[in-house]
């Protein structure tokens, strides 16, 4: 017989199955091209001196063999005498150590026993009820498959799993999803319902992130507020990178974790947009407002846990930048304008109260007035800053108020609301003798002193009731006592105190009468 043909003679060894545990197994036969076929098998046991014979019986009952020698794979053509269009039965007989070992038989039609392709092209990955679902287009002309997957993590070896039978134009597989580690998957297919069909190669790796993206471990710092009223947010520590299985290292689409920065500007709640999401690599400039900053990690399955920080407001104040004039119609604020067409946000809140009680007002875009100032006015009826208490005022500016990262701080300062001149009048003025020609005048601190930078000075007025002469004595805003000297005994005096702001003269306190008694010598 020619080696390329199936030999229709008795094989050159006795026909007896030893029944031993070793021997040939896992016979697979399939078409590999238009006119060529291949059978391959495994051999269990010592391989020295083993000869393999591929046996074939046709539907007519005639049988033949191919001698494979020590090889466990054999190819033949459709001209080799094996009927490829009709059902044949194949098995392997291995002659070793004077005995024959037989594999299990496979019965098939060779012409349509095809070695399948693995999933090709795009494998779509999604999450379904806590499991991983993979889906792909069935390779052309290869509907009907058994599908297996194997998967590994960075620290574990391959584990095998079964996707079950597939019989459609698209195939899918449910696989385990790890909570906290990335996985590499590969898939393979073989013809369904065909005895002895062979597995395809493994597919290209499919890299899958953990269900929960890693929590970002980052730290921020915020620079000092610059002259432009902005401060830079900087990242002190980069997020840790996800550990990947071997086949996913380098280019691993699917396992990417994206980190985004979510800014929430807490100040100026009347502006149009309070939050903005940015890429973590693009660190923004912020105004001096208070912010909450969150870093959100997400992968193809969605967002994970986020980490949140609070950036407190910059409380550096500009005591002189804001002018406030109170008229009969209402109050107007003036401050140095930033540029043309600026929108300003004026925010105020009573000092010592929760930031949640801040009130604000947004101006229409405005240009500087001839003096280069920007203004904001309100009527008494509006009730804005109407109570006689200390308010903390911050003014923010933006040429693009809809863009959260383009706000800047113009100024922060304190203002005493309501009728400040009356409310600030010092109370409890008392006079005590100090010496033969002097007295000490004391008073309770003005309410204005609770407002940093508002109280410019106290003025103490002393009036000689005889001569009607008046003297005024300025006193530092931090002091609540002054000594009046050069007084004459037996003369009646009145003393009054007032508290002045930079733009408002205060109201005098009630006159306090006193005199220095004449000392009579014995």
């Amino acid at each position: 017989c020619r080696t390329s043909e199936c030999c229709f003679q008795d094989p050159p060894y006795p026909d007896a199955d030893s029944g031993s545990a070793s021997g040939p197994r896992d016979l697979r036969c399939y078409r590999i091209s238009s006119d060529r076929y291949e059978c391959s098998w495994q051999y269990e046991g010592p391989t020295a001196g083993v000869s393999h014979f591929l046996r074939c019986c046709l539907s007519s009952g005639r049988c033949c063999y191919f001698a494979a020698g020590s090889a466990t794979r054999l190819q033949f053509s459709d001209q080799a005498g094996v009927s490829v269009l009709y059902t044949v039965t194949l098995w392997v007989e291995s002659w070793a150590r004077n005995q024959t070992e037989k594999s299990p038989e496979v019965t098939l039609q060779l012409y349509n026993s095809v070695k399948y392709e693995p999933p090709l092209g795009d494998i779509k990955v999604s999450k379904l009820a806590g499991q991983l679902r993979m889906e792909w287009e069935t390779p052309d002309n290869q509907v009907g498959a058994e599908v297996q997957f194997r998967h590994r993590t960075p620290s574990s070896p391959w584990k095998l799993g079964d996707c079950g039978p597939q019989d459609d134009d698209t195939e899918s597989c449910l696989c385990p999803l790890e909570m906290n580690v990335a996985q590499e998957f590969q898939l393979r297919r073989r013809q369904l319902g065909s005895q002895g069909s062979s597995w395809s190669k493994w597919s290209s790796p499919v890299c899958v992130p953990p269900e929960n993206p890693p929590q970002p471990q980052v730290r921020f710092s915020v620079e000092q507020l610059g002259q432009d009223g902005r401060r830079r947010l900087t990242l002190k520590e980069q997020p840790t990178q996800l550990e990947l299985p071997e086949g996913c290292q380098g280019l691993a689409p699917g396992t990417e974790v994206t980190y985004r920065l979510q800014l929430h500007m807490l100040s100026c709640p009347c502006k149009a947009k309070a939050t903005r999401t940015l890429h973590l690599g693009k660190m923004p400039y912020l105004s001096g407002a208070a912010y909450n900053v969150a870093v959100i990690s997400s992968n193809q399955f969605g967002p994970g846990l986020n980490q949140t920080w609070h950036i407190p407001a910059d409380t550096h104040t500009e005591p002189v930048a804001l002018n406030i004039s109170v008229g009969t119609n209402g109050t107007t604020m003036y401050w140095p304008a930033r540029a043309q067409s600026m929108t300003y946000c004026i925010e105020w809140q009573p000092v010592g109260q929760d930031g949640g009680l801040a009130t604000c007002s947004l101006t229409a875009p405005q240009d500087p007035d001839p003096a280069g100032m920007a203004t904001y006015s309100w009527s008494r009826e509006s009730g804005a800053m109407g109570q006689e208490k200390c308010y903390y005022i911050t003014i923010f500016a933006s040429a693009h108020p809809e863009k959260l990262t383009l706000w800047s701080t113009v100024l922060s300062t304190y203002h005493f609301g309501g009728n400040a001149s009356a409310a600030g009048t010092p109370h409890h003025v008392s006079v005590k003798n100090h010496s033969l020609d002097s007295v000490s005048v004391d008073w309770a601190p003005s309410l204005l002193s609770t407002c940093p930078g508002v109280l410019k000075e106290y003025v103490v007025r002393c009036r000689d009731e005889d001569s009607k002469q008046v003297s005024e004595h300025p006193v530092q805003p931090t002091e609540t006592q002054v000594t009046l000297s050069g007084l004459r005994a037996g003369v009646a005096y009145t003393v009054q105190v007032r508290a002045d702001t930079a733009w408002l003269r205060g109201v005098w306190s009630q006159p306090q009468r006193f005199s220095i008694e004449v000392q009579v010598s014995d």
Epitope: N112, G144, D167, L192
Partner: nanobody
Framework: EVQLVESGGGLVQPGGSLRLSCKAS????????MDWHRQVPGKQRELVAA???????NYADSVKGRFTISRDNAENTVYLQMNNLKPEDTAVYYC?????????WGQGTQVTVSS
């Protein structure tokens, strides 16, 4: 589900030609194997020609060199070109499709070769 409709059968003289068509109701990209079988009354169906995996062709020894199987993916159709017909080619010709583990058959078309 795949419906198959054959056409092109008829009466032809020995030595003549016929072209059979088998139109599938869905894309033949999803069909693993398409083949033509024939049956003479009282006998078993015989596989005549097959096209596997979209490209690989096989023929029964009795028709090799005379019959050609081909497919038109755009038309979802498989053809059997039969030349140099002989009286023993007279039979009902059936189109068959294997999609996964499912088998689909057409209703058949009669071919008669007679002078």
């Amino acid at each position: 589900e795949v419906q198959l409709v054959e056409s092109g059968g008829g009466l032809v003289q020995p030595g003549g030609s016929l072209r059979l068509s088998c139109k599938a109701s869905r894309s033949i990209f999803s069909i693993n194997t398409m083949d033509w079988h024939r049956q003479v009354p009282g006998k078993q169906r015989e596989l005549v020609a097959a096209i596997v995996n979209g490209v690989w062709k096989n023929y029964a020894d009795s028709v090799k060199g005379r019959f050609t199987i081909s497919r038109d993916n755009a038309e979802n159709t498989v053809y059997l070109q039969m030349n140099n017909l002989k009286p023993e080619d007279t039979a009902v010709y059936y189109c068959h499709a294997k999609r996964g583990v499912s088998d689909y058959w057409g209703q058949g078309t009669q071919v008669t070769v007679s002078s």
